[in-house]
């Protein structure tokens, strides 16, 4: 009866350079329980080598010399007593490519090389990239542990060296970036930046890297309000904006955050549950009315918090003037000027281009001002007759502009009301 030596092992296996592979293997050999029990030794050899002289690539025999180039990288895994000859190959090198055969020895009776079942190992170029693991989403200000690992790599062979690069790492100690793990406290400005983990096998030319784009979740830090593409100045969460009455107004509220905050506009200073007047970052007023003077609030709502800014809208108008008109009354020549403006304008009367300020000490003229609704009225009373033709002007102005009107008083006319010549702007 022929002794039965059998080996189950795959014919070929492919592994990328620098990675690891486990080759399952089982064997059988003729053994009788009545034999003596010398130790069972198993070996993996390079094909073409004579087992009696060659250094082994892996063995459980402590007396056999292992090839220095495979020492620690080729290992027997599993229990050989249970006929397990599985071979673990770590930190695969191009020069490992080739065929290998298995051999069993037990005393003088069992010695056999399984030359019919060779393992063909092919080591190919490394294309595997490392994985960067972390709990998503990254939150601004919250420390997060990141780890870098290469699928298919193992502890065998020289240690792996790591290097991390990226703008988010600038404050880190360089030593920290040489570990497979690092703790990162992302900032809002790190969102969208690249983080790269590079792995290299010490003493080898095998290098691989992966780059990820950081998705940093952060609440809005600032709100900016734009008008015609120009940012409004903001002081203590309030922005002041003067708007010409009747003008169309389009404001854009921007609050950089990730994911984008929900932007809305409210009238005045709203309560948290108030209803917005706009559910976007855009506030449009077709014609600004003075009634809208006061404020609007832009609120940026975000899962990580909210921010809001108050817009103090001041509605202004250029002075509008009616007059002057003059008429003779009992006490003398009576001229009236009506005007309207926001903010309230200042007004002055001129007689022949000379300003008339307050009331004359000699009583030659008197100025009276009153207001009713949006209009304000001023009157000028000139006592005494006119010596010659006169030009009476009134001028209204505020910080936004001015308007003036004048009337020519012709000597000898009894009714001056018809001779009103309103001044052009």
């Amino acid at each position: 009866e022929k002794p039965v030596y059998e080996l189950q092992v795959q014919k070929s296996v492919t592994v990328q350079e620098g990675l690891c592979v486990l080759v399952p293997c089982s064997f059988s050999y003729p053994w009788r329980s009545w034999y003596s029990s010398p130790p069972l030794y198993v070996y993996w050899f390079r094909d073409g080598e004579i087992p009696y002289y060659a250094e082994v690539v892996a063995t459980n025999n402590p007396d056999r010399r292992v090839k220095p180039e495979t020492q620690g990288r080729f290992r027997l895994l599993g229990d050989v007593q249970k006929k397990n000859c599985s071979l673990s190959i770590g930190d695969a090198r191009m020069e490992d490519t080739g065929s290998y055969f298995f051999r069993v020895e037990r005393g003088r009776d069992v010695k056999y090389s399984y030359q019919q079942n060779k393992l063909n190992l092919e080591v190919t170029a490394l294309i595997e990239k490392p994985d960067i693991h972390f709990l998503e989403p990254l939150e601004s200000g919250r420390p997060t542990r990141l780890s870098c690992s290469l699928p298919g790599s193992c502890e065998a062979g020289p240690p792996l060296t790591f290097s991390w690069t990226g703008n988010a790492l600038s404050p880190l100690d360089p030593e920290t970036t040489r570990s497979s793990e690092l703790t990162l406290t992302p900032r809002p400005e790190d969102h969208g930046t690249n983080l790269t983990c590079q792995m290299k096998r010490q003493g080898a030319q095998v290098t691989t890297e992966r780059t990820v784009q950081l998705n940093v979740s952060y609440a809005p830090q600032t709100i900016t309000i734009f008008r015609n593409g120009i940012a409004l100045e903001i002081l203590q969460n309030t922005s002041y904006l003067p708007v010409l009455e009747g003008q169309a107004l389009r404001l854009l509220c921007d609050a950089p955050s990730n994911p984008p905050a929900h932007l809305s506009w409210f009238q005045g200073s709203p309560a948290l549950n108030a209803t917005p007047i706009s559910n976007t970052g855009i506030l449009e007023l077709r014609r600004v009315r003075s009634a809208e003077e006061g404020g609007f609030t832009c609120r940026a709502q975000h899962p990580l918090g909210f921010l809001q800014i108050f817009l103090n809208l001041s509605v202004y108008s250029l002075p509008q003037l009616l007059g002057p008109s003059c008429s003779w009354e009992a006490e003398g020549l009576h001229c009236r000027c009506s005007f309207r403006a926001r903010p309230a304008p200042s007004l002055c009367w001129r007689l022949e281009e000379k300003p008339l300020e307050g009331n004359s000490s000699q009583g030659s003229f008197k100025v009276n001002s009153s207001s009713a609704g949006p209009w304000a009225n001023s009157s000028l009373i000139l006592h005494g007759g006119l010596s010659s033709d006169l030009k009476v002007s009134c001028k209204a102005w505020n910080i936004y502009g001015s308007q003036s009107g004048s009337v020519l008083l012709l000597q000898g006319r009894s009714n001056l009301g018809t001779g009103v010549v309103p001044a052009a702007l």
């Epitope: 004579i50 010695k111 056999y112 090389s113 030359q115």
Partner: antibody, heavy 119, light 112 residues
Framework: QVQLQQSGGGLVKPGTSVKLSCKAS????????IHWVKQRSGQGLEWIGW????????KYNEKFKDKATLTADKSSSTVYMELSRLTSEDSAVYFC????????????WGQGTSVTVSS | DVLMTQTPLSLPVSLGDQASISCRCS???????????LEWYLQKPGQSPKLLIY???NRFSGVPDRFSGSGSGTDFTLKISRVEAEDLGVYYC?????????FGGGTKLEIK
């Protein structure tokens, strides 16, 4: 029990060839290296070469490279040594020896076969 | 080639005496795998050689313990503690570390 049975040899004419055989039994044929050793009458031992059926590995002593050719037939578990262009210098007893194991020794020997080269 | 020099060529002994044979190699016979393949064989008249010692100092199975081997590098010794009649014959040292493998010239152990 490992046995190496030798045959062939005898009286041969100069300039001819002779093929010696060494038939193995009692072990797995591919597991032994078979060596050939020459011993001239009253002289010492000389290693000719080896044949390892496991991987068909053959090694020669340079001195015998043009003299001896080693082959094998796995089906009959036999290793052969052919000696060519015989001269009187080739008259000797030729042994085959089995070498198995890491210990590197020729632990089993054939009985030897005599070759006499004479016209 | 590694030259193996055995001394003495002839060693006359009385039965029960100790015998010692020396073998000197022309170069180190440590194999690239770390082993030293130095062996001793005994050839009795009309017989094939028989293995006594392998790898310098290991006795082959069935070899009596009166045989012992020692040495390292280039100098090796075979000792027989108490010579018996069956020990007579020619002793050869042999190196299997470097091709071509080579034998010593032989030492004849004979009765005084």
């Amino acid at each position: 029990q490992v046995q190496l049975q030798q045959s062939g040899g005898g009286l041969v004419k100069p300039g001819t060839s002779v093929k010696l055989s060494c038939k193995a039994s009692g072990y797995i044929f591919t597991e032994y290296i078979i060596h050939w050793v020459k011993q001239r009458s009253g002289q010492g031992l000389e290693w000719i070469g080896w044949f390892y059926p496991g991987i068909i590995s053959i090694k020669y002593n340079e001195k015998f490279k043009d003299k001896a050719t080693l082959t094998a037939d796995k089906s009959s578990s036999t290793v052969y040594m052919e000696l060519s262009r015989l001269t009187s210098e080739d008259s000797a007893v030729y042994f085959c020896a089995g070498h198995e194991g890491y210990d590197g020794a020729m632990d089993y020997w054939g009985q030897g076969t005599s070759v006499t080269v004479s016209s | 080639d590694v030259l193996m020099t055995q001394t003495p060529l002839s060693l006359p002994v009385s039965l029960g005496d100790q015998a010692s044979i020396s073998c000197r190699c022309s170069q180190s016979i440590v194999h690239s795998n770390g082993n030293t393949y130095l062996e001793w064989y005994l050839q009795k008249p009309g017989q094939s050689p028989k293995l006594l010692i392998y790898r310098v100092s290991n006795r082959f199975s069935g070899v009596p313990d009166r045989f012992s081997g020692s040495g390292s590098g280039t100098d090796f010794t075979l000792k027989i503690s108490r010579v018996e009649a069956e020990d007579l014959g020619v002793y050869y040292c042999f190196q299997g570390s470097h091709v071509p493998w080579t034998f010593g010239g032989g030492t004849k152990l004979e009765i005084k």
